[in-house]
Interface confidence: low
């Protein structure tokens, strides 16, 4: 395959150099990839690639000149699964009816860039889980409420780290699958508001590294398993460890956090029927007690058995009645910080 | 040119699986994503789904999602549509696409059917 | 999904009569991605037209497409006794693609 312009291979193109200053009209509409680099296209116009049905990638990188994406850019290209607009700091505005109707979107990156808002993902409708990866964008201050809507059927990850984000607004993952998100490096942001997941299922993974943030929402981390809090210094204070039922590793800023898992145990999954036998239960109530090994953080209402126990010197096939995991933890505590100089004796026990 | 060979017909029991073929010649295989189609006398063509054959990524058409399994073989430039639990409403044509912007060519179909 | 309505389902046309076969749209169809196809007993299906008005190749200059959004048409300016044949429309626009029931054109 040949191009006056771009270079081509196996319906590949690739359109670089000052000289492209515009999307060729004439690439052929069965191309599969098309990238621009280090280019001089100042306006991506719309419907650029409208008719590009076997297209699977769109590579936009290294274009100092950009500043503008029109409507209809990313638009009813049905193979299309990966978009990578990047290193282009004069990009101001990204059209909000840019990206539509993009059933296998996989991947969106928007990088490097000057954008002052979240592009608009309302109408890309994808059916697949999507990853969408908006770093380094650093005037991007707020994240508004409904902000990821319609991005996709599926669940998604959100990596939003290294931007300029200072304010995120209630119920702004609202309508998401939240498989992760990741907010590290936005060194303003304070505050994740109480609502801030309202209406999202998740997160799963949440890393908050690197901010300002001082406290976590109260609501919405029923099934966060992996919390990453490093160098978070202003996070003083974790929520109630009922509210993180499903919490299974934190990487956290101070070691004092960490004694709160200490002897936290959580059962996991659904126990074998023998282990609702009312004598079963009363035996291990009395052996946790008797043991010491009742957690103080358990509401007061709640057995010990539905918190998770130590089955050891009970009769009963303990493996069946022991689904319980201990949350991973780090930093530990040491010798220079120990667990007993923060929270005493009694709490422990 | 451009061809695409589906054997011709498959007899099969209810209940039985059946796996189809589609041997592409006159092309480079994996640069074209293939579609499988259902065409039953009367009630027009339906979707399946479609397989990129550079590396297996498949899409399903929601009805069919526990019906249809599609593969490739890139080695003998093949792709596999399996059909299990059959019943009589699976007794259909069923072809392969090659559905590209500009180009398009199918396959002439298996006629499937299912009958004990 | 979109369901794909063509009409009429059978119709007869004498040789150099115009004609005219349409497919509607449940819901907007990308022009971008609404496709005709011919289809001949014995055979396997062509492509006849493609992103709504782009003619395949080797298809005859008297044949035409048009429409947007949810209605489109194929025309034949003079009808001649190759163009008898069963045409479906097809979408893409969004998913799962869906097909026509089909027009079968028949030569009086």
């Known amino acids: 395959c040949h191009h006056r312009i771009c270079h081509c291979s196996n319906r590949v193109f690739l359109c670089q150099e000052s000289k492209v200053t515009e999307i060729p009209s004439d690439l052929p509409r069965n191309a599969i990839e098309l990238r621009f680099v280090l280019t001089k296209l100042r306006v991506i116009q719309k419907g650029a690639f409208s008719g590009f049905g076997d297209l699977e990638k769109i590579e936009i990188s290294q274009n100092d000149v950009l500043e503008v994406i029109e409507a209809d850019v990313f638009s009813n290209l049905p193979k299309l699964h990966e978009i990578r607009i990047e290193k282009a700091n004069n990009l101001l505005y990204i059209n909000p009816e840019a990206f539509q109707n993009l059933p296998n979107l996989q991947y969106l990156l928007i990088s490097n860039t000057g954008i002052k808002h979240l592009p608009d993902v309302h109408k890309i409708h994808s059916l697949q889980k999507v990853l969408l990866d908006i770093q380094d964008n650093i005037n991007i201050h707020t994240i508004e409420r409904n902000s990821f809507v319609g991005l996709s059927f599926e669940s998604v990850i959100l990596w939003l780290n290294k931007n300029g984000i200072q304010e995120i607004h209630n119920c702004a993952f609202n309508g998401t699958q939240l498989d992760e998100l990741n907010l590290s490096d936005n060194n303003n942001l304070e505050e994740l508001p109480n609502d801030v997941f309202h209406g999202a299922s998740g997160p799963v993974i949440l890393d908050i590294s690197r901010t300002r943030i001082h406290s976590l929402p109260s609501y919405g981390l029923e099934n966060l398993k992996k919390l990453r809090a490093r160098s978070t210094y202003n996070l003083k204070k974790l929520p109630t460890l009922e509210k993180l039922v499903a919490l299974m590793e934190a990487s956290l800023t101070y070691p004092s956090h960490c004694c709160a898992f200490a002897n936290w145990r959580r059962q996991i999954s659904e126990l074998h029927p023998i282990c609702n036998k009312s004598i079963l239960r009363q035996e291990v109530d009395y052996m946790t007690q008797a043991r010491g090994q009742r957690s103080s953080l358990a509401e007061d209402n709640e057995s010990s058995y539905s918190r998770g126990f130590d089955m050891t010197y009970t009769e009963f096939d303990y493996d069946l009645c022991n689904e319980v995991v201990d949350v991973t933890c780090s930093p530990k505590p040491d010798a220079f910080n120990p667990c007993e100089d923060i929270m005493g004796y009694n709490i422990l026990r | 040119q451009v061809q695409l060979q589906q054997p011709g017909a498959e007899l099969v029991k209810p209940g039985a699986s059946v796996n189809l073929s589609c041997k592409a010649s006159g092309y480079t295989f994996t640069s074209y994503w293939m579609h499988w189609v259902k065409q039953r006398p009367g009630q027009g063509r339906e979707w399946i789904g479609e397989?990129?054959?550079?590396?297996?990524?498949?899409n399903y058409n929601e009805k069919f999602k526990s019906k249809a399994t599609l593969t490739v073989d890139k080695s003998s430039s093949t792709a596999y549509m399996q059909l299990s639990s059959l019943t009589s409403e699976d007794s259909a044509v069923y072809c392969c696409?090659?559905?590209?912007?500009?180009?398009?060519?199918w396959g002439q179909g298996t006629l499937v059917t299912v009958s004990a | 999904q979109i369901v794909l309505t063509q009409s009429p389902v059978i119709m007869s046309a004498s040789p150099g009569e115009k004609v005219t076969l349409t497919c509607s749209a449940s819901?907007?169809?990308?022009?971008?991605?609404l496709y005709w196809y011919q289809q001949k007993p014995g055979s396997s299906s062509k492509l006849w037209i493609y992103?709504?008005?782009n003619l395949a190749s080797g298809v005859p200059a008297r044949f035409s497409g048009s429409g947007s959004g949810t209605s489109y048409s194929l025309t034949i300016s003079s009808m001649e006794a190759e163009d008898a044949a069963s045409y479906f429309c097809?979408?893409?626009?969004?998913?799962?693609?869906?097909f026509g029931g089909g027009t079968k054109l028949e030569i009086k």
């Open positions: 696409a090659r559905l590209s912007v500009g180009f398009a060519y």
């Open positions: 819901s907007s169809v990308s022009s971008s991605y």
């Open positions: 397989i990129n054959p550079r590396n297996g990524r498949t």
């Open positions: 992103s709504t008005s």
């Open positions: 097809h979408q893409w626009s969004s998913y799962p693609p869906t």
